[in-house]
């Protein structure tokens, strides 16, 4: 039987034997295109696709609209992994998406959605959710029905003022809406009343923004 | 420092008044539009009533339409809440709070929406509402 060479997700690479977290390529689907993404292969029995990650205000989140839609940063530290991946992998299979979120006293929680999926560019990455556990809220801190995604220089939310300069970063802003996981990063001890930082409302409430974050996808059938 | 302090709770028997207040500073308050919200002991914090900084539009949750009234006073940088006809139902702890006037939703449906929790920066500790039958 001949080795599989390329690799829509990190599931996939998991189960050729690769099950060492880390950098791997993946291929794009239907095409020869390629993007790094950074594979975790320890929680909860491995195979996730991580497509964002925060820990230390590293990289610049108050992107483009393009720098969104084609990832930035770096895999082994705060990256986005890029919207039209996202978009085109999850619209192929259904996918689960974990978020895990740290905050500065030591504390860890989790939401975990049991289908998620992006909508093409034409719907501006409108994000679909359904089916949210785990310990970081009862309630969803992405606003439900899901909103489009909007950048500094592309504003799709529901408000009057334009959130993703009001608040920062690229994210599936309503109006503003409880969470924003691309916000300023705020180190220890000036983390509180801020309200452009990195947001889970039904976690921490307002103003509080958190030390670090994880969005990693994994097919449901995995 | 930002501070949002209510006032006026108690206990009042079924039927009874009470007017909540709550006083700002900190912050410019004419720039915030302001609300009321309360929470039940084991149940979710829920939406009372809104007033508007910029033109004094109000909104009230269904349970207290009719009953209650929202006012603020930009001179004294204080919003009130006044509670007639209260009932049982109405035991809770009051809180204010206060958010960003630009962050309103776009369209005619703003002020139905003028009570997510999530959009409101400031909150006061709270004061406590008991109605007895």
């Known amino acids: 039987k001949e080795e599989q060479t390329t690799f829509r997700d990190c599931a996939e690479i998991f189960k050729s034997g690769l099950t060492t977290s880390g950098i791997y390529t993946l291929t794009f689907p239907n095409s020869t295109e390629e993007i790094k993404a950074y594979c975790d292969m320890d929680v909860g029995g491995g195979g996730w696709t991580v497509i964002q990650h925060r820990e230390d205000g590293s990289v610049d989140f108050q992107r483009t609209w393009k720098e969104y839609k084609e990832g930035f940063g770096s895999p082994l530290g705060e990256y986005w992994l890029g919207n039209e991946f996202v978009s085109q992998l999850t619209g192929q299979h259904r996918y689960v998406l974990k978020i895990q979120l740290k905050d500065w006293e030591g504390n860890e929680a989790h939401s975990l959605y049991d289908h998620f999926y992006l909508a093409g560019e034409e719907s501006n990455y409108r994000i679909h959710l359904t089916g949210l556990t785990g310990t970081a809220g009862k309630i969803s801190s992405i606003s439900q029905p899901g909103s489009d995604f909007s950048t500094k220089d592309s504003d799709n939310d529901k408000c009057i003022c334009k959130c993703s300069q009001m608040l920062s970063g690229g994210w599936w802003f309503d109006a503003c809406g409880p969470s924003n996981l691309n916000g300023q990063y705020y180190p220890q001890k000036q983390n509180t009343n801020k309200f452009n930082g990195i947001k889970w409302y039904y976690w921490k409430g307002s103003g509080y923004s958190l030390k670090a974050t994880t969005m990693m996808i994994r097919p449901a059938d995995f | 420092e930002v501070q949002l302090v209510e006032s006026g709770g108690g206990l009042v028997q079924a039927g009874g008044s009470l007017r909540l207040s709550c006083a700002a500073s900190?912050?410019?308050?004419?720039?915030?539009?302001m609300g009321w919200f309360r929470q039940a002991p084991g149940k979710e914090r829920e939406g009372v009533s809104y007033i508007s900084s910029s033109d004094g539009s109000t909104y009230y949750t269904d349970s207290v339409k009719g009953r209650f009234t929202i006012s603020s006073d930009n001179a004294k940088n204080t919003v009130y809440l006044q509670m007639n006809s209260l009932i049982p139902e109405d035991t809770a702890v009051y809180y204010c709070a206060a958010r960003p006037w630009t962050r309103r939703v776009y369209g005619s449906s703003w002020l139905a929406r003028s009570l997510d929790e999530y959009e409101y920066d400031y909150w006061g500790q709270g004061t406590q509402v008991t109605v007895s039958s």
């Open positions: 900190g912050f410019d308050f004419e720039d915030y539009d």
